[in-house]
Interface confidence: low
């Protein structure tokens, strides 16, 4: 009926919370009676959705007021025999619309749970609850779909062609033969989504809806779609029956009639054919924050959002901290822009992520007599003769890279290195072979080389 | 690349139990409803379980031939697929696989004889 | 349930012809259909999904078309690989049903 600040808090706020336009939708979750009321227990006797969704449009300064809910019912199916006790959990969430919204999209904004005891077939039975600082009027009842009947919907009530004991129009029940349906409390033709009676042969109204049948929307004079005007007393009349009897749209789908065959309006969460297949589409605008819906590619993803810069989530729905990979280098300070990412550099560095080096030589001199050189907007020392590394900090180990050929020795020394040649080899570097006939001396071929191999000498 | 691997099964008297499980890689376990699937010579592919995400609940749908007796579940922290299988009949024997929900990903299989 | 019906049972063809494979669902199934490739002692493997949609890796000789009802399976030039069994499959409501395959013979 209606959602709203409830009486007496303080300033009321507006569901849409002044950011602009927004629209509501209506959680509906049944959960046996018996078990312990949990956030993390499954809707066991059923869940639903409301699809009836009207955007409502408001501005900052304006009055709060309750919202005014659509006609639109949340059917929520249950499996078996209706338990009579259960749960009702009843969740409303904001979607905020518009392109200023800012923050998040979805809200969860209340939740309602209470115990309930209610048989199937009784009149709409109405409710006000509160949570927090809101309020929410509404109405309930349980059907039974047919051919289930009774109190808890567990018997069958078929029409038979063979003679049975029930009176006229009446139809014996399964899995009790012996037992007859109960006469047909509303007047026939009661609107079973619009009307209710609480006395045999009434057909009583909800808001909205009007005739005797409780057919006729209390806005129009005239009757809708393909309905056609009928006597006086019975206001607009359905021509026979159509494809969308009985509606065949599953999970609150909404049914119209096209050319001889139908089509359903689906809720949020639900597609296929007649509303049967559970499951999100781009149609159901799943992403967030301004994220590009896309059919996935993968056939377990009914779509994929590609999302902006800024943003991550199978939804979009989180915001990235970028800064936290740490993109500046060199100390750089990060500022996350929304748009863009920006390094503020500290002194002496420079470019996109602070990684060109701006120091010159007069900055940091090199040790241990190293010479300071620049190019290419970076600064690097030549060292010393013993000593390497960005400073020349570090002693150089001038035998590390084995200089000496031939089994040569070498030995660190103040000025470099010397080499002590092994028997029959001479040289700075011991590279040279000493020819017994004293001719001249020659390199000589690594081991494993022959003397006379061209590659070597070419 | 992408991995799943099916154990568990083997051989089982009438009215028996079993529990199979399926370790997933290669892909985000924790964002996939998954099935189990079986197959045999009589029966074909034949659909047993699906197991939605957290968020929904770990809502789960079965087939009518296994309903009350199978139960299908999951871990995300081990990227694990459950299914207990009860009240164990001849014409549950098959190779079960353990797929993602509509089947891109299948593991290689393992095989449940129930027979005396 | 959702029956699906292959045909044919089998299907010998010589390497480089073109084969047509047939699945029909026994109501309307949008095109929330599937076709698996399954060779000798192997899993499934997906090769179209939504109908159409030529799975990733899966060669450009395989195409799927169809919608509602009537769903083909065409190998423009069958190769000696392509012998495997292959099932039409629906995930189009619950519960999910199979087609019971048609086997693919190479000559």
């Known amino acids: 009926h209606s959602f709203g600040p409830g009486p007496g808090l303080g300033t009321p706020r507006s569901p849409c919370n002044a950011r602009g336009p927004c629209r509501l939708f209506f959680r509906v979750c049944l959960k046996p009676g018996v078990s312990q009321e949990a956030t993390e227990s499954l809707c066991a006797l059923g869940a639903a959705l409301s699809t009836s969704v009207p955007v409502y449009t408001e501005h900052p300064g304006e009055s709060a007021a309750a919202l005014p809910l659509p006609d639109g019912l949340v059917r929520v199916p249950f499996r078996d025999a209706w338990p009579g006790t259960f749960s009702l959990v009843i969740e409303t969430w904001r979607e905020q619309l518009g392109e200023h919204a800012g923050g998040p999209a979805w809200n969860l904004l209340a939740r309602v749970v209470g115990r309930r005891r209610l048989a199937a077939g009784g009149p709409w039975a109405r409710d006000v609850q509160r949570t927090g600082t809101w309020e929410l009027h509404f109405s309930y009842r349980a059907r039974c779909e047919p051919p289930a009947v009774g109190a808890a919907c567990a018997r069958l009530c078929r029409s038979r062609s063979a003679p049975s004991r029930c009176g006229p129009g009446l139809r014996p029940c399964t899995p009790f033969p012996d037992e007859c349906e109960a006469p047909s409390v509303c007047r026939p033709g009661c609107s079973p989504e619009h009307g209710y009676c609480e006395e045999p042969d009434e057909c009583r109204c909800l808001e909205g809806w009007t005739g005797p049948l409780c057919t006729v929307p209390v806005s129009t004079s005239s009757c809708l779609n393909s309905r056609v005007p009928g006597p006086a007393s019975t206001g607009c009349l359905l021509p026979g029956p159509g494809p969308c009897d009985g509606n065949p749209c599953a999970n609150g789908g909404s049914c119209s009639e096209t050319s001889g065959s139908f089509e359903c309006a689906c809720p949020r969460g639900f597609y296929g054919l007649r509303c049967e297949v559970s499951g999100v589409t781009c149609a159901d605008g799943p992403c967030f924050n301004g994220g590009l819906c896309v059919g996935g590619e993968d056939p377990d993803s009914a779509y994929v959002c590609h999302c902006p810069p800024g943003f991550q989530g199978s939804n979009c729905e989180k915001r990235v901290d970028r800064c936290s990979l740490q993109p500046c280098q060199n100390g750089g300070l990060c500022l996350d822009l929304g748009h863009a990412l920006r390094c503020r550099c500290r002194a002496g560095f420079a470019g996109p992520r602070c990684e060109h080096d701006l120091d010159d030589c007069a900055g940091r001199a090199c040790a241990n007599g190293g010479t300071c050189v620049e190019g290419g907007g970076s600064r690097r020392c030549s060292c010393a003769l013993g000593f390497g590394g960005r400073d020349c900090r570090e002693r150089a180990d001038p035998c590390a890279s084995r200089p000496c050929a031939h089994g040569g020795r070498c030995y660190a020394h103040f000025s470099g290195l010397v080499c002590a040649c092994a028997p029959g080899y001479m040289g700075v570097r011991c590279e040279f072979a000493v020819r017994p006939d004293g001719a001249d001396a020659v390199p000589a071929a690594p081991r494993g080389l022959r003397q006379a191999d061209p590659q070597r000498f070419l | 690349e992408v991995n799943l691997e099916e154990s568990g099964g083997g051989l089982v008297q009438p009215g028996g139990s079993m529990k199979l499980s399926c370790v997933v890689s290669g892909f985000t376990f924790s964002n996939y409803w998954m099935s189990w699937v079986r197959q045999s010579p009589e029966k074909g592919l034949e659909w047993v379980a699906e197991?939605?995400?957290?968020?929904?609940?770990?809502?789960?749908h079965y087939a009518e031939s296994v309903k009350g007796k199978f139960t299908i579940s999951r871990d995300d922290s081990k990227s694990r697929l459950y299914l207990q299988m009860n009240s164990l009949r001849p014409e549950d024997t098959g190779i079960y696989y353990c797929?993602?929900?509509?089947?891109?990903?299948w593991g290689q299989g393992t095989l449940v004889t129930v027979s005396a | 349930n959702i029956v699906m019906t292959q045909s044919p049972k089998s299907v010998s063809m010589s390497v480089g012809e073109r084969v047509t494979l047939s699945c029909k669902a026994s109501?309307?199934?949008?095109?929330?259909v599937y076709w698996y490739q399954q060779k000798p002692e192997q899993s499934p493997k997906m090769m179209i999904y939504?109908?159409?949609n030529r799975y990733t890796g899966v060669p450009d000789r395989f195409t799927g078309s169809g919608s509602a009802t009537d769903f083909t399976l065409t190998i423009r030039s069958v190769q000696a690989e392509d012998l495997a069994d292959y099932h039409c499959?629906?995930?189009?409501?619950?519960?999910?049903?199979f087609g019971s395959g048609t086997k693919l013979e190479i000559k």
């Open positions: 939504g109908a159409s």
């Open positions: 197991i939605r995400l957290k968020s929904d609940n770990y809502a789960t």
């Open positions: 499959g629906q995930s189009y409501s619950y519960p999910f049903t």
């Open positions: 797929t993602s929900n509509r089947f891109a990903y």
């Open positions: 109501e309307n199934v949008g095109t929330y």
